[in-house]
């Protein structure tokens, strides 16, 4: 039994620096507690963007200062990352861990390439 994690290959952030994508996992067991972590890989550097642990059937709760929000539905997690700028362009990888009950399972997606384009500053208007 293995755990497969699927996520979209490419997402374009909105002009307000918001990007959303779905992370879906095929659970080999009946997990009641799941941890979802978003990792960013760019220039061979890996950083943890955010992480949340949730009980199946309950809402996904990130820390108050997190740039991520999300909702869960069954084996699907809808992730939203806010406050993105052009320099944040990179591969965002969804890591899913079935925490409880044992056995623990690990699943890592192939990553979603998020492209962020900084908006052009508004030209001064002469009115």
């Amino acid at each position: 039994k293995a755990m497969h994690v699927a996520q979209p290959a490419v997402v374009l952030a909105s002009s307000r620096g918001i990007a959303s994508f779905v992370c879906e996992y095929a659970s080999p067991g009946k997990a009641t507690e799941v941890r979802v972590t978003v990792l960013r890989q760019a220039d061979s550097q890996v950083t943890e963007v955010c992480a949340a642990t949730y009980m199946m059937g309950n809402e996904l709760t990130f820390l108050d200062d997190s740039i991520c929000t999300g909702t869960s539905s069954g084996n699907q997690v809808n992730l939203t990352i806010q406050g993105l700028r052009a320099m944040d362009t990179g591969l965002y990888i969804c890591k899913v861990e079935l925490m409880y009950p044992p056995p623990y399972y690990l699943g890592i997606g192939n990553g979603t390439q998020i492209y962020v384009i900084d908006p052009e500053p508004c030209p001064d208007s002469d009115f």
């Epitope: 293995a2 497969h4 941890r35 890996v46 642990t53 409880y100 056995p103 623990y104 690990l106």
Partner: antibody
Framework: QVQLVESGGGVVQPGRSLRLSCAAS????????MHWVRQAPGKGLEWVAV????????HYADSVEGRFTLSRDNSKNTLYLQMNSLRAEDTAVYYC????????????WGQGTLVTVSS | EIVLTQSPGTLSLSPGERATLSCRAS???????LAWYQQKPGQAPRLLIY???SRATGIPDRFSGSGSGTDFTLTISRLEPEDFAVYYC?????????FGPGTKVDIK
């Protein structure tokens, strides 16, 4: 830099208890799965237990389930392994190890502490 | 649990030679969640490879990992004197996390 230092090993009689400590520095324990791995004299490596992230979830190898208990003191950035009802087959060097970013491979290890269970 | 078998048990080679170590799993190791470690006498193990083929920080490029599913290989392209040690594979896709019994690489 990341450092793990175990202590608390020694000689103990069968049926008795011992508590091992693992002092971590250079990172925050709660951001990682923290594991104990043991190695009996002249033998291979055996995974013993893990305490996950916020410390609520712990998983144990069948060989120690019900006898060993993991805990953590975040203020001291220290991990503990309470070993009860010790048996001769628990004799080993016990290593504290940090799980990796991409899963439970072990990217940093302590130097190990020897536990000898003998009458 | 996933049982890992390593072969050969002992590999006797000379410095400069190529070493090929095998690790076989009793069931598929999902998404190549397999690591390799090196251990020298009296020392803690050292991570060499994770994810079946990714080299850990500071590991020389003479070490390489490959494989998927149930069959994995660690290759040391040219043995250096400091490479003579015991090598373990480990799976981390599900608990309990298990190690192979090890392959000892010694000097011929």
């Amino acid at each position: 830099q990341v450092q793990l230092v175990e202590s608390g090993g020694g000689v103990v009689q069968p049926g008795r208890s011992l508590r091992l400590s693992c002092a971590a520095s250079g990172f925050t324990l709660s951001n990682y799965g923290m594991h104990w791995v043991r190695q009996a004299p002249g033998k291979g490596l055996e995974w013993v237990a893990v305490i996950w992230y916020d410390g609520r979830n712990k998983h144990y190898a069948d060989s120690v389930e019900g006898r060993f208990t993991l805990s953590r003191d975040n203020s001291k950035n220290t991990l503990y392994l309470q070993m009860n009802s010790l048996r001769a087959e628990d004799t080993a060097v016990y290593y504290c190890a940090r799980g990796g970013v991409w899963g439970s491979y072990f990217d940093y290890w302590g130097q190990g502490t020897l536990v000898t269970v003998s009458s | 649990e996933i049982v890992l078998t390593q072969s050969p048990g002992t590999l006797s080679l000379s410095p400069g030679e190529r070493a090929t170590l095998s690790c076989r799993a009793s069931q598929s190791v999902s998404s190549s969640y397999l690591a390799w470690y090196q251990q020298k006498p009296g020392q803690a193990p050292r991570l060499l490879i994770y994810g079946a083929s990714s080299r850990a920080t500071g590991i020389p490029d003479r070490f390489s990992g490959s494989g998927s599913g149930t069959d994995f290989t660690l290759t040391i392209s040219r043995l250096e004197p400091e490479d003579f040690a015991v090598y373990y594979c480990q799976q981390y896709g599900r608990s309990p996390f298990t190690f192979g019994p090890g392959t000892k690489v010694d000097i011929k």
